[in-house]
């Protein structure tokens, strides 16, 4: 009679994470008598996966009834597969012995590869806001995928970006992998409504890539432009001066009026109007009683936007001239102040 052979017909098996792996094994003879054991790996450090004779293996079930005397099918199923289960599995026949059973013959092994989906990509931008015309870095991370091959692309509003660097770790063999990519994105004045998208394609996703997004509204700061103008007279001794604060984002803005360097009024932007590009406009006005001033008045509109250093625009109100003769300010009437000017 021919000596017993242990046959593992599948050199490799590929299983998606969460599914059940079937590892096939048959013996060519019933002799010698003795149990079958399954191991992952070979040598002294191998890991016991299933022992026909004893032990509790909750994730493992046998394909056939091993208690039947004439059974020669020792295939097993391992449920709820994770990337950590990847490896080479050996079906090993033992010969009954005393006091211990003795290893008799091993199958050639079946390599179990686990296909694991990447986690949803997480995109993060800079720690602080940046202004238009600056290049900022965005990172994208996705974890837990297998096999290692993966494709990552960056987009800004549907346009593919080319300035990025991507790493897949670890470099060597592993049960699962992570990807980390950093893209450089140039901000423009129109980017309040823009999005940066990181797209990950992997064999497990069946052509339906995963996407992570970042809204540039979280990243951009568009500084305002200021314009101070003198409006037509309301009453004989009153002049209305307005400060137009235009094209700013985000909305957080505080405005202070100064008369000859002294604080007259402070207010916070509330009823703003939104532009098509997502930036805001706001107008503040100051009613100046000309009769209360003997000399010319320097009116300054000072704006603190999103916690940045204050910026300002000034306007000289000529008290000596009759209020009705005052027109809009010209560039020559814009004078400096102790703050940075917005223009």
């Amino acid at each position: 009679e021919e000596e017993l052979q242990v046959i593992q017909p599948d050199k490799s098996v590929l299983v998606a994470a969460g599914e059940t792996a079937t590892l096939r094994c048959t013996a060519t003879s019933l002799i010698p008598v003795g149990p079958i054991q399954w191991f992952r790996g070979a040598g002294p450090g191998r890991e016991l996966i299933y022992n026909q004779k004893e032990g509790h293996f909750p994730r493992v079930t046998t394909v056939s009834d091993l208690t039947k005397r004439n059974n020669m099918d020792f295939s097993i199923r391992i449920g709820n597969i994770t990337p950590a289960d990847a490896g080479t599995y050996y079906c090993v026949k033992f010969r009954k012995g005393s006091p211990d059973d003795v290893e008799f013959k091993s199958g050639a092994g079946t390599e179990l590869s686990v296909r694991a989906k990447p986690s949803a990509p997480v995109v993060s931008g800079p720690a602080a806001r940046a202004t238009p015309q600056h290049t900022v870095s965005f990172t994208c991370e996705s974890h837990g995928f297998s096999p290692r091959d993966i494709t990552l692309k960056w987009f800004k509003n549907g346009n593919e970006l080319s300035d990025f660097q991507t790493n897949v770790d670890p470099v060597g063999e592993s049960v699962s992998y992570s990807i980390h990519s950093t893209a450089k994105v140039v901000l423009t004045r129109e980017d309040v409504h823009s999005q940066v998208i990181c797209e990950v394609a992997h064999v497990t996703l069946q052509g339906d890539p995963l996407r992570g997004t970042a809204n540039l509204s979280e990243t951009i700061r568009v500084p305002p432009t200021l314009e101070v103008t003198q409006q037509p007279v309301r009453a004989e001794n009153q002049v209305n001066v307005t400060c137009q604060v235009r094209k700013f984002y985000p909305q957080r803005l505080q405005l202070t009026w100064l008369e000859n360097g002294n604080v007259s009024r402070t207010e916070t932007a509330s009823t703003v109007t939104e532009n098509k590009d997502g930036t805001y406009n706001w107008m503040s006005w100051l009613l100046v009683n000309v009769s209360a001033h003997r000399d010319d008045v320097k009116l300054t509109c000072q704006v603190e936007h999103d916690g940045q250093p204050a910026v300002s625009k000034s306007h000289d109100l000529k008290v000596s001239a009759h209020p009705k003769e005052q027109g809009s300010n010209t560039a020559a009437e814009n004078t400096g102040s102790n703050e940075r000017n917005i223009y």
Partner: antibody, heavy 119, light 107 residues
Framework: QVQLVQSGAEVKKPGASVKVSCKAS????????IHWVRQAPGQGLEWMGD????????ANNQKFKGRVTMTRDTSTSTVYMELSSLRSEDTAVYYC????????????WGQGTLVTVSS | DIQMTQSPSSLSASVGDRVTITCKAS??????VAWYQQKPGKAPKLLIY???SLETGVPSRFSGSGSGTDFTLTISSLQPEDFATYYC?????????FGGGTKVEIK
């Protein structure tokens, strides 16, 4: 008071790199951009780029085709400008200057760093 | 890139003279123009920003005007310490660009 203190003069060979530092003090470092401007002997001013220490955002003059790298160390309030693949025409005084973030003029300047490129 | 054409490249004037330097941008730069003064061996010093705003501590004899593409720096009464080179600069679009400079010399 606001101060920008730059590193000392450097002599480099063509093809080498130079790294100039600019240490800021007297204001909130992360609120202002730091710009780099150079001036060749007897010539005018040329803007090289800027970095915003808060966001790490940079803007570059494409004339330098990626030869300029600007970095910042917020723990020491220092900005660095590295210029690689040096050639003789890079011989210049390199200035750092401060500007309020978002298109404002440069109100405080460093003392300048002379970089000489010669074989 | 936006070109800043500054004129004249040099001028000779006497103490007390009114001096005007002009700068023309190759495209609209709104009000985002600054003027700097530079003396030999020194870093530039900001005089005017936002076309017409005087930097803190700068004497009132310096003034700026203009809008769009045409800008002017005026020194109403030239003083001995004003002999230097003056540069205009646009800061609307990167790369920020400077004019070629105007050297103001003693007549």
């Amino acid at each position: 008071q606001v101060q920008l203190v730059q590193s000392g003069a450097e002599v480099k060979k063509p093809g080498a790199s130079v790294k100039v530092s600019c240490k800021a003090s007297g204001y909130t470092f992360t609120d202002y951009e730091i710009h780099w401007v150079r001036q060749a002997p007897g010539q005018g001013l040329e803007w090289m780029g800027d970095i915003h220490p808060g966001s790490g955002g940079t803007a570059n003059n494409q004339k330098f085709k990626g030869r300029v790298t600007m970095t910042r160390d917020t723990s020491t309030s220092t900005v660095y400008m590295e210029l690689s693949s040096l050639r003789s025409e890079d011989t210049a005084v390199y200035y750092c200057a401060r500007a309020v973030s978002g298109y404002y003029a440069m109100d405080y300047w460093g003392q300048g760093t002379l970089v000489t490129v010669s074989s | 890139d936006i070109q800043m054409t500054q004129s004249p490249s040099s001028l000779s004037a006497s103490v007390g003279d009114r001096v005007t330097i002009t700068c023309k941008a190759s495209e609209d730069i709104y009000d985002r123009v600054a003027w700097y003064q530079q003396k030999p061996g020194k870093a530039p010093k900001l005089l005017i920003y936002g076309t017409a705003s005087l930097e803190t501590g700068v004497p009132s004899r310096f003034s700026g005007s203009g809008s769009g593409t045409d800008f002017t720096l005026t020194i109403s009464s030239l003083q001995p310490e004003d002999f230097a080179t003056y540069y205009c600069q646009q800061y609307w679009t990167t790369p920020w660009t400077f004019g070629g400079g105007t050297k103001v010399e003693i007549k």
